[in-house]
């Protein structure tokens, strides 16, 4: 019925409007409403226009696409011509009573399907389903997928390309890991991956100063160290380095009229020359302070050597040996002095004897036929040596003796002229001065080392060398190496050394063959009153702590790996220091300070005495241990 | 008051292994270090094993050494003594004990179990 | 390994009277030195430790002394529950070691 009225509509319009020209109201008449007739009038004088002979050629622009004037007028009630649909975006064009609706295909929108839908923006489909990346197109969308991304057969979702097993050799010798959208080249910590190269080259750290002092780079790594002689340790960073604490301060306060016996390791540290009238004899008195069993007081003799007497101390008693022109003689006798103690000790020569006193009651009284020294020109000239011998006597002593004492004397007065001029020798150089209190034991003041040649060998022992240790140690610093054996090369086979812990207040005992740490005793308080114990034993199988301590260790099979490293030094020469390391690299030891505090060591058995050692620091005391500072009210 | 209470003991031909389990209570089992001591029947205290508070070092006497085996499960405050090739001479109670101090040194004994018998016998 | 020796192995003393323990080291054990009491079918219970310092809950007639390799136990006046074996016991080094023990009984 609605086309029949359309055909109708058309022909009236045929009619009245073409075959002849028709106005407004005549037009009313065809269409029978205003608003069809409102459009369509203005139009139809434009198709006149364009069409009626002689008009301007810009007229017919907007009617272009008609031949003719039936053309242009039949398509004035059509909406839908000229199409106003956007051409891309509409589906179909409905034309109404001076309107049209355009029906839009998926994916546009708009009266005239003139918008494209972004379906990558519908908050209802988030992404557009797209697991990557959602691109927008006009009318429509699709999605791909990153670099190293396949997309799979649903068009939406993207699978990862394992890059590593599609070219194996994509890294070289470095490991290829996949990972997603790409790989990576992956090195051991340590090392950087060569892109040229494809190889993984070790990264050298010590190039990019990461150590504060020293730093020794090796493949794969690095490691700083401190320079422990110059007391300084590495800090808990690993990195930066700083000074090595006292933990215990040690009363080191001296007295200019004390004289320090054990200046020098070898020598004599004081000497004297005695111009007397004939008559004079000999005598010595002086108050005497030492723990060493063994040393000399002092040693006298005639300006030509041929008459000498010796002052000495041998098992911890008073020794005179004496050799003139008349006698040879050696007496030992008397209490053991070697108290720590002050004794006060006289040798005087009487007309016919020497008489040796302590505490002023006589202990000793040897006969002599004739002078001591024998006075030439009516002058008696004598040569007065402490703590040592002017030069090698040794074959011409009654028995040898080593004459190393480490002890004091005060309230001297020789050949009955006292003290005068030597005080002021004395005042003047303070390592000479003796400390004022002191204890038993022996002193390391964290600035030298003491070396011995130890056999370890032990030719009935079917494990071959054996080294059982026993250290009693009272530390005053927390850092520091107590014993180490190193060999001809310059490596440290073996060593014990104390660190300060991270517990706060406390010291690990490190025990290390090389630069590897085997054993840590863990979180002692060391720095302490007491003295504190060690006890260990070592042969080629086995380290094995025998005080019941709590200790960290390496694996077994690393242990014995260790021990065939020291196995090995051991069958070579090593020489064994005690407070610290010789001249040997920061990095053969994991600890290079030297030890600072008192230390007595037991090496298979035997009680090292300093005084027997190689070489001696003269700033190690072998028999005196200053005592713990206690704070007093004023201090 | 520590309660130290041990298990596990009876009779095991000579050859055989046993398991004994001490169970601790009433103090901090982790912190400290301990111990199984054993008495013969008739004889003094010998002292067997030790070990530290985590489990991590051993200790054993030169007549035990390769056969018994110390050791703990701090989760459930447990300390194990595991015996095996038992001979006769091993017959003894065997007390566990706990040591004196923690921290870094192995100590005397402060508690004792009341101990469990181990006989070897045919 | 240390040693530990231990006299009298039985002592006999009237309750109320004195009694003295004797303990000796092989080697040196410095102070590390413990004094255990134990009575008929029970488990040992220690009485001091340092050699002379006396563990919580022990009276004060029980005492110790000495250092190195010589120590001492003495109980100042025995009551009816002292009667027991004593054992004395180093914790110097591994292995820890104790003495055969002394068995205090009533005379």
């Known amino acids: 019925a609605n086309s029949m009225l359309e055909e109708t509509k058309q022909g009236n319009l045929e009619r009245e409007c073409i075959e002849e020209l028709c106005n407004k109201e005549e037009a009313r008449e065809v269409f029978e409403n205003d608003p069809e007739t409102d459009y369509f009038y203005p139009k139809y004088l434009v198709c006149l226009r364009s069409f009626q002979s002689g008009l301007f050629t810009a007229a017919r622009q907007s009617t272009d696409a008609y031949p003719d004037l039936r053309s242009c007028v039949n398509a004035i009630p059509d909406q839908c011509s000229p199409l106003p649909c956007n051409e891309d975006g509409y589906m179909s064009c409905k034309d109404g009573k001076a309107s049209f609706t355009c029906t839009c295909k998926p994916g546009w929108q708009g009266e005239k399907c003139e918008f494209d839908i972004n379906e990558c923006k519908d908050p209802s489909n988030i992404n557009g389903g797209c697991s990557q990346i959602c691109d927008n197109t006009p009318g429509s969308y699709h999605c791909s997928c990153k670099s190293g991304f396949v997309m799979l057969s649903n068009k939406k979702d993207c699978k990862d390309v394992d890059e590593c097993s599609l070219k194996p050799n994509m890294c070289g010798t470095a490991v290829c890991k996949n990972i997603p959208g790409d790989f990576e080249c992956e090195c051991p910590e340590g090392y950087r991956y060569n892109l040229k190269s494809k190889s993984c080259e070790d990264v050298d750290e010590c190039s990019e100063n990461m150590c504060a002092q020293l730093c020794v780079n090796y493949p794969g790594g690095y490691t700083c160290y401190c320079d422990g002689k110059k007391g300084f340790k590495l800090a808990q960073d690993q990195k930066s380095c700083e000074a090595v604490s006292v933990c215990l301060p040690l009363n080191l306060d001296t007295k200019y009229e004390l004289l320090y016996l054990a200046e020098q390791f070898a020598g004599v540290v004081l000497y004297l020359k005695f111009r007397l009238p004939e008559i004079s004899r000999f005598s010595a008195e002086f108050d005497f302070r030492t723990y060493d069993s063994q040393g000399v007081i002092l040693y006298a003799e005639s300006i030509d050597h041929s008459a000498w007497l010796l002052i000495a101390l041998r098992g911890g008693k008073i020794e005179v040996q004496l050799k003139n022109e008349h006698t040879s003689k050696i007496t030992t006798g008397g209490d053991i002095i070697n108290n720590g103690l002050w004794n006060m000790v006289s040798v005087e020569e009487l007309e016919h004897s020497i008489s040796i006193k302590i505490a002023k009651e006589a202990v000793m009284d040897i006969n002599k036929p004739g002078p001591l020294f024998k006075p030439e020109n009516g002058l008696l000239e004598t040569k007065v040596y402490f703590a040592g011998f002017p030069r090698k006597v040794e074959s011409e002593l009654i028995k040898p003796i080593n004459p190393r004492l480490d002890g004091c004397i005060r309230s001297w007065n020789l050949m009955k002229q006292g003290a005068s001029g030597i005080k002021e020798i004395i005042q003047e150089k303070q390592n000479k001065h003796c400390l004022v209190t002191v204890e038993k034991g022996s002193y390391y003041p964290g600035s030298g080392i003491a070396e011995f040649h130890i056999d370890y060998n032990n030719g009935s022992n079917a494990e071959g060398w054996h080294i059982n240790v026993t250290l009693n140690i009272r530390p005053s610093m927390g850092t520091g190496v107590m014993l180490a054996l190193v060999s001809s090369n310059n490596t440290v086979p073996f060593a014990v050394s104390l660190v300060d812990s991270t517990s706060e207040k406390s010291q690990d005992i490190v025990i290390s063959v090389e630069n590897t740490v085997i054993y840590r005793i863990q979180a002692l308080s060391l720095c302490s009153n007491q003295r504190s114990h060690l006890e260990f034993r070592v042969n080629r199988n086995n380290l094995e702590l025998l005080t019941p301590l709590k200790i960290e260790t390496i694996s077994q099979e690393e242990l014995q790996t260790q021990l065939a490293i020291l196995d090995k030094a051991m069958k070579g020469k090593v020489a064994t220091y005690l407070g610290g390391l010789p001249d040997v690299p920061f990095s053969a030891t994991p600890v290079n300070a030297f030890y600072n505090g008192c230390m007595e060591v037991n090496i298979n058995g035997v009680e090292l005495d300093l005084d027997e050692a190689i070489s001696k620091h003269n700033d190690i005391r072998a028999h005196s241990c200053p005592s713990v500072w206690k704070k007093t009210k004023n201090s | 008051e520590v309660q130290l209470l041990e298990s596990g003991g009876g009779l095991v031909q000579p050859g055989g292994s046993l398991r004994l389990s001490c169970a601790a209570s009433r103090f901090s089992f982790s912190s400290y270090a301990m111990s199984w001591v054993r008495q013969a029947p008739g004889k003094g205290l010998e002292w067997v094993s030790a070990?530290?508070?985590?489990?991590?070092?051993?200790y054993y006497a030169d007549s035990v050494k390769g056969l018994f085996t110390i050791s703990r499960d701090n989760s459930k405050n447990t300390l194990y003594l595991q015996m095996n090739s038992l001979r006769a001479e091993d017959t003894a109670v065997y007390y566990c004990?706990?040591?004196?101090?923690?921290?870094?040194?192995?100590?005397?004994?402060?508690?004792w179990g009341q101990g469990t018998l181990v006989t070897v016998s045919t | 390994e240390i040693v530990m020796t231990q006299s009298p192995a039985t002592l006999s003393v009237f309750p109320g009277e004195r009694a003295t323990l004797s303990c000796r080291a092989s080697q040196s054990v410095r102070s590390n030195l413990a004094w255990h009491q134990q009575k008929l079918g029970q488990a040992p219970r220690l009485l001091l430790y340092?050699?002379?310092t006396r563990a919580t809950g022990i009276p004060a007639r029980f005492s110790g002394s000495g250092s190195g390799t010589e120590f001492t136990l003495a109980i100042s006046s025995l009551q009816s529950e002292d009667f027991a074996v004593y054992y004395c016991?180093?914790?110097?080094?591994?292995?820890?070691?104790f003495g055969g023990g002394t068995k205090v009984g009533i005379k």
């Open positions: 016991q180093q914790y110097n080094s591994w292995p820890f070691t």
């Open positions: 340092g050699a002379s």
């Open positions: 070990i530290s508070d985590s489990g991590s070092n051993t």
């Open positions: 004990a706990k040591n004196y101090e923690s921290g870094g040194y192995y100590t005397f004994f402060d508690y």
